[in-house]
C-alpha cells in the first residue's frame, strides 16, 4: 500500500485547510490509527491529533476546536483532517503517520501554505500643479503573503517604481507613480492594480487626478465694434479662462469705478443701454488658489450722431500673476 497526499496544501487566510492523508491499500488491509504532527525546524515536532479507528479523534488541547475530521461519509482508510480557520502561524510542514494492519506503518509530509490576501491602500501625492517637474502623483501599498504584485493602469504618461519590505510572515510592496503635471491630465483616472494568488480577481483602487492650473484670460464681446453704439441694449463682455480649481472672476474699470447700471455676474459684465459714459478700459481679474490672471480691454461707445468720432481698433492686454 501507499499514502496518497499532497506536497503542498494551499489555503487562504481564515479558510479551513484539508490536510490529506489517504491509505491506498489492498481490500483486506485496515488503518488502525493516523497521527498528525506539525514539524517545525525551530520548535521540532508538535503533535496535532490522533485519529484512532476505535476511539475516534483525539486533539492536542492547543488545537482543540481547530482540528476535525472531514464531514461524512468517511472512508475508513482516509486519515485526512481539517484545520479550521487557518492563520499565518499555521504555515509550515505537517506529517501524517498511518499505522495499518497487516502492512505496517507509513508516513508522509506536506507543506501548508497560508495565503494572506492584501488589503491595498492608495495615497495621493502632494497637490499637482501645472509647471512642476516630475512629481509623485500617488503611491499604492499592499501587504500579503506571498508578496503581492502592485502595478498601475492609466492612460496618463508617467513612470512607476516599486520597493518591497519583507516581514517574518509577509511582504509589503509599495509602488509610486510619478508624472509631469499638465492640464490634460485633469480628471484622468489613475488605477492601482493589486494581484495576488489569494485573490479571485485583482483588487483595483482608482484615484482621479487633479492638476491645478489657470489658463490665460481673454475677453469676448468686442468682436464687432459696430455693435457698441449709443442706445444699444444687452451689450456684454465675457471673460474667458479655465482652471482647476475653478477660478473666480471679478471686473473693474481701470480709469474709475464701474459706471452706474453696469452689473457683474460671475465672468460676465452686463451693460445697460449704452451711452458714451460706458467708454473706458475694463479689466477682468481671474484667480484660483494657484494663480491669478488679468485681461483688459478698451471699450469705445460710438455715437451715430457724431460721425466724426472713429475707432479703428479695440486694444486688449493680458497680465498674469502666480500665487
Amino acid at each position: 500500500g501507499e499514502l496518497e497526499t499532497s506536497d503542498v496544501v494551499t489555503v487562504v487566510l481564515g479558510q479551513d485547510a484539508k490536510l490529506p492523508c489517504f491509505y491506498r491499500g489492498d481490500p483486506d488491509e485496515q488503518v488502525g490509527q493516523v497521527a498528525w504532527a506539525r514539524v517545525d525546524p525551530n520548535e521540532g515536532i508538535r503533535e496535532l491529533a490522533l485519529l484512532h479507528s476505535k476511539y475516534g479523534l483525539h486533539v492536542n488541547p492547543a488545537y482543540e476546536d481547530r482540528v476535525e475530521q472531514p464531514p461524512p461519509p468517511r472512508d475508513p482508510l482516509d486519515g485526512s483532517v481539517l484545520l479550521r480557520n487557518a492563520v499565518q502561524a499555521d504555515e509550515g510542514e505537517y506529517e501524517c503517520r498511518v499505522s495499518t494492519f497487516p502492512a505496517g506503518s507509513f508516513q508522509a509530509r506536506m507543506r501548508l501554505r497560508v495565503l494572506v490576501p492584501p488589503l491595498p491602500s492608495l495615497n495621493p501625492g502632494p497637490p499637482l500643479e501645472e509647471g512642476q517637474g516630475l512629481t509623485l502623483a500617488a503611491s499604492c501599498t499592499a501587504e500579503g503573503s506571498p508578496a503581492p504584485s502592485v502595478t498601475w493602469d492609466t492612460e496618463v504618461k508617467g513612470t512607476q517604481s516599486s520597493r518591497s519590505f519583507t516581514h517574518p510572515r509577509s511582504a509589503a510592496v509599495t509602488s509610486e507613480f510619478h508624472l509631469v503635471p499638465s492640464r490634460s491630465m485633469n480628471g484622468q483616472p489613475l488605477t492601482c492594480v493589486v494581484s495576488h494568488p489569494g485573490l479571485l480577481q485583482d483588487r483595483r483602487i482608482t484615484h482621479t487626478l487633479q492638476v491645478a492650473f489657470l489658463a490665460e484670460a481673454s475677453v469676448r464681446g468686442l468682436e464687432d465694434q459696430n455693435l457698441w453704439q449709443v442706445g444699444r441694449e444687452g451689450a456684454t463682455l465675457k471673460c474667458l479662462s479655465e482652471g482647476q480649481p475653478p477660478p473666480k472672476y471679478n471686473w473693474t474699470r481701470l480709469d474709475g469705478p464701474l459706471p452706474s447700471g453696469v452689473r457683474v455676474k460671475g465672468d460676465t459684465l452686463g451693460f445697460p443701454p449704452l451711452t458714451t459714459e460706458h467708454s473706458g478700459v475694463y479689466v477682468c481679474h481671474v484667480s484660483n488658489e494657484l494663480s491669478s490672471r488679468d485681461s483688459q480691454v478698451t471699450v469705445e461707445v460710438l455715437d451715430p450722431e457724431d460721425p466724426g468720432k472713429q475707432v479703428d481698433l479695440v486694444s486688449a492686454s493680458h497680465h498674469h500673476h502666480h500665487h
Epitope: G32, Q33, I45, E47, H52, Y55, R97, S105
Partner: antibody, heavy 121, light 107 residues
Framework: EVQLVQSGAEVKKPGSSVKVSCKAS????????MHWVRQAPGQGLEWMGW????????NYAQKFQGRVTMTRDTSISTAYMELRSLRSDDTAVYYC??????????????WGQGTLVTVSS | DIVMTQSPSSLSASVGDRVTITCRAS??????LNWYQQKPGKAPKLLIY???SLQSGVPSRFSGSGSGTDFTLTISSLQPEDFATYYC?????????FGQGTKVEIK
C-alpha cells in the same frame, strides 16, 4: 509548580476493583491529557491509556479494554483510573502522568508519585 | 505493537565515565523516541523527547541521537546522581511502548 498527587496504597482481593485518583495542581487541568502507566514489581513500564480532561475522551491500550475506565472531575482537577476484575498480576505501582504540550499523546513530562495496588487473596 | 529493545540490560560504570545506552524499535519510528530516568522507589523523569530534545531542567551531559529504528542515550560524564534505570519509549503510535530498561550501577 506542577504537581500530581495520587491516592494511597490499596490492597485488593482478586476479582474486585480499584479506583486510583490523581489530583493536579500548578497548571490548567483541562489543557493537558492525562495518562496512566503501571509498573509491576521489578518490571518495566506499561502504558494503559489516556483521558482528555477537557472532553472526557479516552484511548485505552487493547490489553486493558473492557477492564479499565478513566474519568475525571474538572471541578477538583482530578483524574481517576478504575481497574476491574483484578488478578494477582495486576499488582503494580500505578502512575498518572501528564502528556506534554508538544506531544500530548506520547510524551510524559510530569508524573505522580505512584500508587501501589496489591492484589492478594 | 511496536517492540522496543534496549541494550545492555545493565552496565557498571564509574563517576566521570562516558555512558551509552542503545534502543532499537521493531519498525521505523522516525524521531518519536523519548528517554526517562527512574530511581528506586521514585516515579520516572523525562530526560529527552523527540530523540534529541533535552527536557527543560535536565543537565546538558545527557544527550540523545538517532532516527528510524536505532537510538542512543549518552551521558557524557557520569555523576553520582545518575545511577538509575533508564527507559526508552516510542510515541510514534499507540499503544505507547517502553523498552525493558537499562540499569546503570556503580562499578
Amino acid at each position: 509548580e506542577v504537581q500530581l498527587v495520587q491516592s494511597g496504597a490499596e490492597v485488593k482481593k482478586p476479582g474486585s476493583s480499584v479506583k486510583v485518583s490523581c489530583k493536579a495542581s500548578g497548571y490548567t487541568f483541562t489543557g493537558y491529557y492525562m495518562h496512566w502507566v503501571r509498573q509491576a514489581p521489578g518490571q518495566g513500564l506499561e502504558w494503559m491509556g489516556w483521558i482528555n480532561p477537557n472532553s472526557g475522551g479516552t484511548n485505552y491500550a487493547q490489553k486493558f479494554q473492557g477492564r479499565v475506565t478513566m474519568t475525571r472531575d474538572t471541578s477538583i482537577s482530578t483524574a481517576y483510573m478504575e481497574l476491574r476484575s483484578l488478578r494477582s498480576d495486576d499488582t503494580a505501582v500505578y502512575y498518572c502522568a501528564r502528556g506534554s504540550a508538544l506531544h500530548f499523546f506520547g510524551v510524559f513530562d510530569y508524573w505522580g508519585q505512584g500508587t501501589l495496588v496489591t492484589v492478594s487473596s | 505493537d511496536i517492540v522496543m529493545t534496549q541494550s545492555p540490560s545493565s552496565l557498571s560504570a564509574s563517576v566521570g565515565d562516558r555512558v551509552t545506552i542503545t534502543c532499537r524499535a521493531s519498525q521505523s519510528i522516525s524521531s518519536y523516541l523519548n528517554w526517562y530516568q527512574q530511581k528506586p522507589g521514585k516515579a520516572p523523569k523525562l530526560l529527552i523527547y523527540a530523540a534529541s530534545s533535552l527536557q527543560s531542567g535536565v543537565p546538558s551531559r545527557f544527550s540523545g541521537s538517532g532516527s528510524g529504528t536505532d537510538f542512543t542515550l549518552t551521558i557524557s560524564s557520569l555523576q553520582p546522581e545518575d545511577f538509575a534505570t533508564y527507559y526508552c519509549q516510542q510515541s510514534y503510535s499507540t499503544p505507547l511502548t517502553f523498552g525493558q530498561g537499562t540499569k546503570v550501577e556503580i562499578k
